[in-house]
């Protein structure tokens, strides 16, 4: 912490500008008014302050707002956001999507930090649910965001928000998460026709039950092996050889390469050898 010293004559900052770049830490502490800093936070981002100087500016804001910063200041934190701790952020009440976007922009290109995770958590809790605009924003910055949520947290996602989800956003989701998301996706896309529906639902199928897979097998969807391998084992096991053949279409030949891997391995063991032989792939049950 910077020692408290009087501001030298002529060095009191009338505004936040580039003349402060070469101030020493103690001079920033003594000569920059915290209230002025709060009203001109938007300028800080354009000035090449060192991380040491940013520490001093943060300290001034902390003293001015011990209960947490107002959103008018938070929105313009810029690089100073990187100095915040999760404890600092827990004091905030962030309600504007624009504020969220501004802070995520600062962290762009980096992995999700504890600060960002706390910020998102505060924001979503404040909104009560993960609406489409929020999800759009979060997945744009962090494609893996959705899969970082617990099944309980995912349950607050309204079906309408599912339209914002891209296939890559689900890459790291586990079956428990897809179990929650799939019914929402099914509801969201229910009014689409067969082929369009399959394109949209495909990424969510890791949460689909047997009856839905059976229904899909009647629609000539030609599911690729990558999607098939992500299906729930318990949902695949009851499928007949004929149903799997219809589900995969021309991709059925890929079963041979995957015969030692779940769910294909377990499914093969459940089938009669005569039925498997009809595929002509040499699969051994």
């Amino acid at each position: 912490e910077v020692e408290k010293t009087a501001c030298p004559s002529g060095k009191k900052a009338p505004e936040i500008d580039e003349s402060l770049i070469f101030y020493k830490k103690w001079e920033l502490e003594a000569c920059v008014d915290a209230a002025l800093l709060a009203t001109q936070m938007d300028r800080v981002n354009a000035i090449p302050f060192t991380y040491e100087q940013l520490d001093v500016l943060k300290h001034k804001l902390d003293e001015l707002y011990p209960q947490g910063y107002p959103e008018s200041v938070i929105q313009h934190l810029g690089y100073l956001f990187l100095k915040m701790s999760p404890e600092d952020i827990r004091k905030w009440n962030v309600t504007s999507l624009e504020t969220l976007k501004a802070l995520l922009e600062v962290n762009k290109g980096h992995e999700m930090s504890p600060q960002v995770a706390t910020l998102i958590d505060r924001f979503v809790k404040g909104r009560g649910q993960l609406d489409k605009d929020t999800l759009d924003t979060l997945t744009a910055f962090y494609p893996g965001y959705l899969c970082s949520l617990s099944p309980e947290e995912l349950s607050s996602v309204p079906p309408s928000s599912i339209w914002a989800v891209r296939p890559q956003d689900l890459d790291t989701c586990d079956p428990r998460q897809l179990d929650v998301l799939y019914p929402k996706a099914r509801l969201a896309f229910q009014n689409m026709n067969g082929s369009e529906y399959f394109v949209k639902i495909q990424s969510f199928l890791g949460g689909a039950p047997t009856e839905d897979l059976k229904a899909l097998s009647q629609q000539n969807v030609s599911m690729d092996l990558a999607t098939f391998m992500k299906l729930r084992t318990d949902a695949v096991l009851p499928l007949t050889v004929a149903e799997v053949q219809k589900l995969l279409g021309p991709h059925v030949e890929g079963l041979k390469a995957e015969e030692r891997h779940r769910p294909v391995r377990d499914w093969i063991l459940r089938q009669r050898q005569d039925d498997l032989d009809t595929l002509g792939l040499g699969l051994q049950g």
């Epitope: 770049i21 070469f22 020493k24 000035i47």
Partner: antibody
């Protein structure tokens, strides 16, 4: 050991542009601001501007606004200065210089890049 | 911007002699910085924050002053001290340098 290695001498025609590099080694590049300084005829030194390698934010001496553009490449720990619309007035030695902790002077300097603008 | 005037412009000293050069600022500054430059070389930081010796600088160098008047002193001149010395301020934006004092060996 700390080192700022600048690119070699440049001979360019009036009206052209040039980009001078300054590669930092031996310290954490993003922890210290980088300055650029002009020296004409081995005499006076003029401060051109400063850049924060961590955030890419910069500030310029009014005299060099529009003439110089400062950038950094964090991946190679290199600072750059581009000078455009060159005239004979721009012929000089240009230095990059690191600012020490808590603004304690330009503690490390590059070896200088000689720019000659001539037709 | 603040103008720094160095005097004398040129001076010479014998080995072992005490040398003092001054730097006068057109307005008050908080700190002064001093650099040494030898022909064909980059400037080298000697003194920071008015009176602190930079790393590796011999203790025969010292700096002092306040307000608008600052000085650099070499307690005992040595041949290797022959160089041009520049003062610099950044209390007021933009940073500025003095025009230099050229120190020769007698």
């Amino acid at each position: 050991e700390f080192q700022l290695q600048q690119s070699g001498p440049e001979l360019v025609k009036p009206g052209a542009s040039v980009k001078i590099s300054c590669k930092a080694s031996g310290y954490s590049f993003t922890d210290y601001n980088m300055n650029w300084v002009k020296q004409t005829n081995g005499k006076s030194l003029e401060w051109i501007g400063i850049i924060n390698p961590n955030y890419g934010t910069s500030s310029y001496n009014q005299k060099f606004k529009g003439k110089a553009t400062l950038t950094v490449d964090q991946s190679s720990s290199t600072a750059y200065m581009q000078l455009n619309s060159l005239t004979s007035e721009d012929s000089a030695v240009y230095y990059c210089a690191r600012v020490g902790r808590d603004n304690s002077g330009f503690d490390y300097w590059g070896q200088g890049t000689t720019l000659t603008v001539s037709s | 911007q603040i103008v720094l005037t160095q005097s004398p412009a040129i001076m010479s000293a014998s080995p072992g002699e005490k040398v003092t050069m001054t730097c006068s600022a057109s307005s008050s500054v908080s700190y002064m910085y001093w650099y040494q430059q030898k022909p064909g070389s980059s400037p080298r930081l000697l003194i920071y924050d008015t009176s602190n010796l930079a790393s590796g600088v011999p203790v025969r160098f010292s700096g002092s002053g306040s307000g608008t008047s600052y000085s650099l002193t070499i307690s005992r001149m040595e041949a290797e001290d022959a160089a041009t010395y520049y003062c610099q301020q950044w209390s007021s934006y933009p940073p500025t340098f003095g025009s230099g004092t050229e120190l020769e060996i007698k």
